[in-house]
């Protein structure tokens, strides 16, 4: 799995342990080993949500399986909670796109997962 | 909806009201309320199009519905026009990927839109 | 086609001709003309893979057609090789998401490819 956060929150406001915490929490939530999880946080972005530049985040979670109605609701609760607690971003100013990737469409280590 | 522009145009060349204008224009074009629209502009990028680093842009528009053949052509005309007028990027150096998102695959406010 | 690389490798470690090389290699691999190929490299990113911040990369390749099981394995071999040779990123710390785009969902030059 790969989780990406783009946010207008400044770099200085991203806690040191945030990526580690995301890795562990996503491993637990997806049931995938932490060694397969990639996390990417992009602060200081030029972005607006509802036309204002109050703190906001545009995110994506890509996974081979483990994506679906109930699971995505769980991930959203978890991730919006972390973004609120750690980056002070209001949950109603967060979008998270979920992608259920086909194993043949994910490259890794010189090949694919298919 | 969420509109993202990645471009090699410098930050100083992004007009003050560009994100606001994109928000309003996309609200009108998609028929979705402006309060649901997120805009993200990423200038100063290391990118090439056709092997050259003349001004260019790689964009994406994610929406739950309102994506389709005729609609995408309209969005492309609108967005390429704005990128040309505001950032001076030639329309033949712009790609825009359109994504019709399933409501269950978009997280917001601690849950999803499903 | 559009190839995007996000990496925690610093800007100074991205060779001068890297984007040109990617353009040529992708043109050859996809069988698409170089003038249609866009390349975007984003260095200095705040990212982890397997919970560590050793060099890693999160990539995507979008194309209208030319995406599939065998082709993606070929692209992965090629791209992981280039990322290893040029940016010194271990292939087992690279993910590449492949997207087979519908022509109607790719905007260019004020319209779409449909």
């Amino acid at each position: 799995p790969m989780f990406i956060v783009n946010t207008n929150v400044p770099r200085a406001s991203v806690p040191e342990g945030f990526l580690s915490e995301l890795t562990q929490q996503l491993a637990q939530a997806t049931g995938k080993p932490a060694q397969y999880i990639a996390v990417h946080v992009v602060p200081d972005q030029l972005m607006t949500f509802s036309g204002t530049n109050d703190p906001c985040a545009l995110c994506s979670l890509h996974s081979i399986g483990k994506i679906g109605g109930a699971q995505n609701r769980n991930y959203s609760k978890l991730l919006c909670g972390l973004l609120s607690d750690r980056l002070h971003i209001s949950p109603d100013r967060v979008y998270i796109n979920y992608y259920d990737m086909n194993a043949a469409n994910v490259g890794w280590n010189g090949s694919t997962f298919a | 909806p969420m509109f993202i522009v990645n471009t090699n145009v410098p930050r100083a060349s992004v007009p003050e009201g560009f994100l606001s204008e994109l928000t309003q224009q996309l609200a009108q074009a998609t028929g979705k309320p402006a309060q649901y629209i997120a805009v993200h502009v990423v200038p100063d990028q290391l990118m090439t199009f056709s092997g050259t680093n003349d001004p260019c842009a790689l964009c994406s528009l994610h929406s739950i519905g309102k994506i389709g053949g005729a609609q995408n052509r309209n969005y492309s005309k609108l967005l390429c026009g704005l990128l040309s007028d505001r950032l001076h990027i030639s329309p033949d150096r712009v790609y825009i990927n359109y994504y019709d998102m399933n409501a269950a695959n978009v997280g917001w406010n601690g849950s999803t839109f499903a | 086609p559009m190839f995007i690389v996000n990496t925690n490798v610093p800007r100074a470690s991205v060779p001068e001709g890297f984007l040109s090389e990617l353009t040529q290699q992708l043109a050859q691999a996809t069988g698409k003309p170089a003038q249609y190929i866009a390349v975007h490299v984003v260095p200095d990113q705040l990212m982890t893979f397997s919970g560590t911040n050793d060099p890693c990369a999160l990539c995507s390749l979008h194309s209208i057609g030319k995406i599939g099981g065998a082709q993606n394995r070929n692209y992965s071999k090629l791209l992981c090789g280039l990322l290893s040779d040029r940016l010194h990123i271990s292939p087992d710390r690279v993910y590449i998401n492949y997207y087979d785009m519908n022509a109607a969902n790719v905007g260019w030059n004020g319209s779409t490819f449909a």
């Epitope: 400044p10 200085a12 406001s13 806690p15 040191e16 342990g17 945030f18 580690s20 915490e21 562990q24 109050d54 703190p55 609120s84 607690d85 750690r86 980056l87 002070h88 209001s90 100013r93 | - | -």
Partner: antibody, heavy 122, light 107 residues
Framework: EVKLEESGGGLVQPGGSMKLSCAAS????????MYWVRQSPEKGLEWVAE??????????YYAESVKGRFTISRDDSKSSVYLQMSSLRAEDTGIYYC?????????????WGAGTTVTVSS | DIQMTQSPASLSASVGETVTITCRAS??????LTWFQQKQGKSPQLLVY???TLAEGVPSSFSGSGSGTQFSLKIISLQPEHFGSYYC?????????FGGGTKLEIK
Amino acid sequence: EVKLEESGGGLVQPGGSMKLSCAASGFTFGDAWMYWVRQSPEKGLEWVAEIRSKAHNHATYYAESVKGRFTISRDDSKSSVYLQMSSLRAEDTGIYYCTSHHYGSSWYFDVWGAGTTVTVSS
Amino acid sequence: DIQMTQSPASLSASVGETVTITCRASENIYSYLTWFQQKQGKSPQLLVYDAKTLAEGVPSSFSGSGSGTQFSLKIISLQPEHFGSYYCQHHYGRPYTFGGGTKLEIK
């Protein structure tokens, strides 16, 4: 200058009530998350309550030891945060500090008031 | 609740010496740890956040390290103004607990 100033402390009998106030200045109070922390020789420093900003619906959280007895609130127009304490016990005795971390700074307790002393005794 | 165990509880040292105070969390708190200094009769002052980042205006004689469950605060070349009490605190999740404190006294 960033400043927090507590008031309202004093002597109160067990079972009684008391309301503490904290006036903030020098930063955008509306964006700040505000906290009460107390200190006593017996228990040391102890987080008591938290109230988030309007953008976070003024969400409130409490230490288990005060839940149901204490209420944190805020008035953004007055740049003030309050702690209403009821059913007070001897173990609530201590110095009560108002503290905050505000948007744009680190997200830690980087601003503290001088404290106000609460004594619960008969 | 996460327990924060600080050691030593008290410490005597001379001006110019180097001292290290440690803090152990009862579970993984990543780097969500802060250190405070408190002088007699005053409120706590933030010294270090994110386990190792010095707060604004804090001299480089202070340094924080650690992650997970083991953390330390090092003070080199002790000065008279460094004497007082030091506390660690986690903010990984509520309740945000503090260590019991370390009283640093002049020998």
